[in-house]
């Protein structure tokens, strides 16, 4: 831990000769900055410099080449690289007076004579004198006002509101302060503050826009903070709104933005009290150009059962806004001829949905469909390929001679999507074929019997069984199945002999 | 030496208010921005709210931002958190913190359990 | 806000190991960090400040580095009583967000 700095003269105060020089030397285990009280404005004649010494300790030298009644005040040496803005500032002090017998009280800023009390609290009129030893008295509209006083900070007590002037007599001459106007303020736990971007995502060359608005509230410093401040990129307006109520509209604009302005875009309100803080923030993304992304939450091949109502949604990110539109096989998708609708809608400031719909999926609704979003900036599309899955169903079972052999083929065409699986089955004692148990599916490897399976089309499959020889009556069962159903049909198959008995007959 | 000693833990309903103090001595408290840290059962520490030396600001984090107010008074050394609208989540021990170092918290007190619960 | 992630989530050790904690902010916090120590019921203690600074009455065995995003705490020799669980915590501006914390378990 860095022990405290020390200060020379080593002294708790001092008083300094009007017009005279002073100078203030801080020594230091680390590099040590002064705080004093003219602002960087007045302080012209204050000059602070490093020193070099054989000690190994950092000196900071406070220099005043001519001294004034505004030179009064306290001066703090202090490690500038260990302060937190939490605490006070710590370091070493010495507070510095500079009598002048013309000016009796050191002169303030206009904001300093209001002074603010909250909630019956204790305040401090900040009337200080140049000298220590100056008598002072705090007056009001009633007379003299019974209050501690302190040379170095002023009158602290409990006052109503109202004007108070402090005098002072030096050398046989009065002196008065203008009037500190005392001002109470209802201590509210929150202020009312609202952050609104009508945009969080530019490109380059856009102009940013952010406001702040503070409600029922005019005491308020309000202080943005965002990634060109260090620039001084932004401008900054205020507008104050009387009717109905009040209301103060901070504007932050930052012209002609570039990739660099991106980050948190801050407004901190602060009561003139400093007591209620209230922040916003709001994130910025500032893009080289524009630019598009398509997130589909379906696969590049999708089915749809026939007669489904099927949605296909489609996220985009984009900026600036695009124009989307569907294809389909590459044309234009009119909706008005298909019971297909798509529509786009906004979820977020960049963000987009595209539904693409199906009322009643038929089979011509397959094919590719493709998603395609434009701007000024960039182009992307998404094509998948959908299929309409329809039940399987046979659409012929026949049978074919081959003469004298007696060898048959039995020909069963279905048709589906996906393209059906054809099973066979027979039934050898034609008298029992209505109980199922009497039906065995004709496996492949069986002798004299051959079966084979051709596809026709994408959706029509056509399956062949052959006997080679046929000797009695048998039922033939051609059983089509998909995914989305199974149909079957029967064919009786007569042996040649007994079909030539029957044709005599 | 320095003490933070926590106190007004206990067990409280959702939507109950409780308020926490912190006495401190052996330092010069007036100077210190002051913190409340908590700690849920079982989880990790989580900072809460800071309050300046001089009261002029404070922050709070998000997740008790408008339920919690952190308040202080320098004459009595004593920091406070008063606690309304509390719900499950809220449920840990309660620390206050400071310190110089950096902004570091060089001293803690012992903690307080606050246990909201139906 | 600034994330500050902790790996790893545990660690188990022997006594005269050397073990390395790592943490990393979301955003650049420059020196800005410490590292706290806590024990089961107790409340954490301050071991190293402003990423590298030795807090006093602090064992040497500990140490820390690290600047911008990336840090570490290191344990040269680990002693019995060092069994716990440590948080880094960013300590500029606030929220003063901590680590989800690294348990350093007995082997």
């Known amino acids: 831990q860095l022990s405290l700095p020390s200060i020379l003269p080593n002294e708790n105060e001092k008083v300094v000769q009007l017009n005279s020089s002073f100078s203030l030397r801080c020594f230091g285990e680390s590099e040590v900055s002064w705080q004093y009280p003219m602002s960087e404005e007045e302080s012209s004649d204050v000059e602070i410099r490093n020193e070099e010494n054989n000690s190994g300790l950092f000196v900071t030298v406070l220099e005043v080449s001519s001294a004034s009644a505004a030179h009064t005040g306290l001066y703090t040496c202090y490690y500038n690289h260990t302060q937190t803005e939490e605490n006070e500032l710590e370091g070493r002090h010495i507070y510095i007076y500079v009598p002048d017998p013309d000016v009796a009280f050191v002169p303030l800023g206009m904001t300093d004579y209001l002074v603010i009390v909250e909630d019956d609290d204790s305040a401090i009129i900040p009337c200080r004198t140049t000298d220590p030893e100056t008598p002072v008295t705090l007056h009001n509209s009633e007379g003299v006002v019974p209050a501690s006083y302190d040379s170095r900070q002023g009158f602290n007590g409990t006052f109503t509101v109202g004007p108070y002037i402090c005098e002072a007599t030096v050398k046989g001459k009065k002196f008065q302060t203008i009037p500190f106007n005392v001002y109470a303020l209802k201590a509210t736990s929150e202020l009312d503050l609202e952050m609104e971007a009508l945009k969080t995502v530019y490109k380059s060359g856009e102009t940013i826009v952010v406001t702040c608005a503070v409600f029922n509230n005019e005491v308020v410093d309000l202080q943005w903070t965002y990634p060109g401040e260090v620039k001084g990129k932004g401008i900054t307006m205020l507008e104050e709104i009387k009717v109905p109520s009040i209301k103060l509209v901070y504007t932050l604009t930052v012209p002609e933005a570039t990739v660099k302005d991106s980050g948190d875009y801050e407004c901190a309100a602060r009561q003139a009290t400093r007591e209620v803080k209230e922040m916003k923030k709001v994130t910025i993304s500032v893009h080289e150009k524009g630019f598009i992304e398509i997130k589909p939450t379906f696969s590049q091949l999708e089915a749809v059962n026939l007669h489904e109502v099927k949605h296909f949604v489609v996220e985009v990110r984009a900026y600036p806004p695009p124009r989307i539109s569907w294809l389909k096989n590459n044309l234009t998708l009119i909706e008005n001829l298909t019971e297909i609708t798509t529509d786009v809608e906004k979820i977020q400031e960049i963000r987009y949905r595209s539904k693409l719909k199906l009322i009643r999926a038929k089979e011509e609704d397959s094919g590719h469909y493709t998603i395609v979003a434009q701007n000024e900036d960039a182009v992307k599309s998404y094509t998948f390929e959908l299929l309409t899955q329809v039940p399987s169903s046979i659409l012929d079972l026949v049978d074919d001679h081959h003469g004298s052999t007696g060898g048959q083929t039995v020909r069963c065409t279905a048709e589906g999507t996906p393209l059906p699986d054809i099973e066979w089955m027979i039934c050898k004692d034609i008298k029992k074929c209505n109980n199922e148990t009497s039906w065995t599916i004709l496996a492949n490897n069986v002798s004299n019997i051959i079966t084979e399976i051709h596809s026709r089309d994408r959706s029509t499959v056509e399956g062949r069984v052959t006997f080679a020889k046929v000797e009695e009556t048998i039922a033939v069962r051609c059983l089509a199945k998909n995914l989305l159903g199974a149909e079957n049909r029967e064919l009786k198959l007569v042996a040649p002999t007994l079909r030539s008995e029957l044709t005599v007959a | 030496q320095v003490q933070l000693v926590e106190s007004g833990g206990g067990v409280v309903q959702p939507g109950r208010s409780l308020r926490l103090s912190c006495a401190a001595s052996?330092?010069?408290?007036?100077?210190?921005?002051m913190h409340w840290v908590r700690q849920a059962p079982g989880k990790g520490l989580e900072w809460v709210a800071v309050?300046?030396?001089?009261?002029?600001?404070?922050y709070y984090a998000d997740s008790v931002k408008g339920r919690f107010t952190i308040s202080r008074d320098n004459s009595k050394n004593t920091l406070y958190l008063q606690m309304n609208s509390l719900r499950a989540e809220d449920t840990a021990v309660y620390y206050c913190?400071?310190?110089?170092?950096?902004?570091?918290?060089?001293?803690w007190g012992q903690g307080t359990l606050v246990t909201v619960s139906s | 806000d600034i994330q500050m992630t902790q790996s790893p989530s545990s660690v188990s050790a022997s006594v005269g190991d050397r073990v390395t904690i790592t943490c990393r902010a979301s955003?650049?916090?420059?020196?800005?960090l410490a590292w706290y120590q806590q024990k089961a019921g107790k409340a954490p203690k301050l071991l190293i400040y402003?990423?590298?600074s030795l807090q006093s009455g602090v064992p040497s065995r500990f140490s820390g580095s690290g600047s911008g995003t990336d840090f570490t705490l290191t344990i040269s020799s680990l002693q019995p009583e060092d069994f716990a669980t440590y948080y880094c915590q960013r300590t500029n501006s606030f929220p003063r967000t901590f680590g989800q914390g690294t348990k350093v378990e007995i082997k």
């Open positions: 913190a400071g310190g110089r170092s950096r902004g570091a918290f060089d001293f």
């Open positions: 309050i300046w030396y001089d009261r002029s600001n404070k």
């Open positions: 052996g330092f010069t408290f007036s100077s210190y921005g």
């Open positions: 402003a990423a590298s």
């Open positions: 955003q650049d916090i420059s020196s800005w």
